[in-house]
Interface confidence: low
């Protein structure tokens, strides 16, 4: 499932006024684009130019983070008179473009998405033929990517005065809500300890002591789904297991 | 004929102001973007402002951003940069210069004034 | 900003010799740079653009070259009227970016 916000045209000219009705260099591109970690998306990008019937050569450029300056995740080249956009670049090989250049649009599919693919992208043109002239989007599209909850790390560490702490990592977006239960924390409890903390699509949570011998489960869970896991704490000679 | 002719150079104390001018002709300015490009007494060249053909898009560089001020008349040919809060460091010969491309890019200067000496010394 | 690098900072040459001046850009900028000339107490002229395109009224001694990163301005055979400074200006993107200049001297 893809859901795209309301397109916005990134236009520095055509809020000017002009006696002759020539076309002048605009981008749209949508706000945000979202789709769930594991699927694709695609990234709408169409432009307009002032170079009437442009069939010099061409390339395709996006680019993610920042624009101008950002690294490149794809690129193609056209030749003079092909509608055939030659990928010179795709990162790890999942980006597509969809659209045609030669038609004014530059769409690109992103397959395989991965939280780390959540970020602005920014689409570039150039013209380098009898007319040399390029533009890039100023503002870019956000690909907003979705993700159930997924525990990536759970673990029991020295804490002071010879007690034991536990710590949960979690991913997912939107970020996941943490919860513990164990012995004495009561059952199910739902408390979200205050130490918890978020960091880009990682959510940890501590709890700081562990008093009682026993299971201590961590849960996950957010708007897409949960996910839980746990350690088991048995106090032999002072030390720990956890699995 | 094609040319660029700047004028309202100076000498000003540190913290005044100045406007300076570009008169166009010979082309259809409203068509290309324009800009202002300095060199300080021995030294390179420096990029200091660019405005869209329209007017629309004003773009600086961060030395100058908030004290300098581009603007263009199309009626008149005119190109403008206004100069606030004058530095020492804005000492330097500012050439104003035409875009080779019509769009609000300007790809590369294809035509340059003579330039005009703006000193800034108490 | 994109950092535009000029090598060598000075060459000196003797009329009749090639001569070729590099520049090197910061980042990637595609073929949007350009060459000038500028000799002293005058502007600029323009050379060539898009990295290889020669300026209309230049005589074709001189030449551009490269993309991405790493550029080359060739004068074939120089002239008197060659000796000068000059300049590469990236157009990639704005804040527009010079290099330090070269300057041509005779040898």
């Known amino acids: 499932f893809v859901r795209t916000k309301i397109d916005t045209t990134e236009n520095l000219l055509n809020t000017e006024v002009h006696s002759s009705p020539v076309q002048r260099w605009s981008m749209q591109v949508p706000a945000e684009v979202s789709a769930a970690a594991g699927d694709a998306a695609v990234l709408p990008c169409t432009f307009t130019h002032p170079h009437r019937h442009y069939d010099g050569p061409l390339t395709a450029i996006w680019r993610a983070g920042e624009p101008y300056a950002g690294p490149q995740v794809f690129r193609c080249a056209a030749a003079r008179g092909s509608e055939l956009c030659q990928t010179a670049l795709s990162l790890h090989g999942r980006f597509r473009l969809l659209g045609n250049p030669r038609r004014n649009d530059l769409s690109l599919r992103v397959e395989r998405l991965a939280l780390a693919d959540d970020r602005r992208y920014f689409c570039r043109v150039e013209f380098a033929g009898d007319v040399h002239d390029r533009y890039e989007s100023r503002h870019g599209v956000r690909l907003h990517v979705t993700a159930a909850p997924r525990i990536i790390n759970i673990s029991v560490l020295p804490g002071p005065a010879h007690a034991f702490r536990a710590l949960c990592t979690t991913e997912g977006e939107p970020p996941p809500a943490l919860a513990w239960s164990g012995p004495a924390l009561g059952n199910g409890s739902a408390a979200v300890p205050s130490s918890g903390q978020g960091h880009g699509h990682l959510v940890t949570a501590e709890l700081p002591a562990l008093n009682h011998d026993g299971r201590y489960t961590c849960t996950a869970a957010n708007s897409l789904g949960r996910s839980e896991a746990s350690v088991y704490l048995f106090r032999f000679h002072g030390a720990s297991a956890s699995t | 004929e094609v040319q660029l002719l700047e004028s309202g150079g100076g000498l000003v104390q540190p913290g005044g102001s100045l406007r300076l001018s570009c008169a166009a002709s010979g082309f259809t300015f409203s068509s290309y973007a324009m800009s202002w490009v300095r060199q300080a007494p021995g030294k390179g060249l420096e990029w200091v402002s660019t405005i869209s053909g329209g007017g629309g898009s004003t773009y600086y560089a961060d030395s100058v951003k908030g004290r300098f001020t581009i603007s263009r008349d199309n009626s008149k040919n005119t190109l403008y940069l206004q100069m606030n809060s004058l530095r020492a460091e804005d000492t330097a010969v500012y050439y104003c210069?035409?875009?080779?491309?019509?769009?609000?890019?300007?790809?590369?200067?294809?035509?340059w004034g003579q330039g005009t000496m703006v000193t800034v010394s108490s | 900003d994109i950092q535009m690098t000029q090598s060598p900072s000075s060459v000196s040459a003797s009329v009749g010799d090639r001569v070729t001046i590099t520049c090197r850009a910061s980042?990637?900028?595609?073929?949007?740079l350009a060459w000038y000339q500028q000799k002293p107490g005058k502007a600029p002229k323009l050379l060539i653009y898009?990295?290889?395109s020669l300026q209309s009224g230049v005589p074709s001694r001189f030449s551009g070259s490269g993309s991405g990163t790493d550029f080359t301005l060739t004068i074939s055979s120089l002239q008197p009227e060659d000796f000068a400074t000059y300049y590469c200006?990236?157009?990639?993107?704005?804040?527009?970016?010079f290099g330090q200049g070269t300057k041509l001297e005779i040898k």
């Open positions: 898009v990295a290889s």
């Open positions: 210069a035409k875009a080779i491309g019509s769009s609000w890019y300007s790809d590369a200067f294809d035509l």
């Open positions: 980042q990637d900028i595609s073929s949007w």
């Open positions: 200006q990236q157009s990639y993107s704005i804040p527009y970016t």
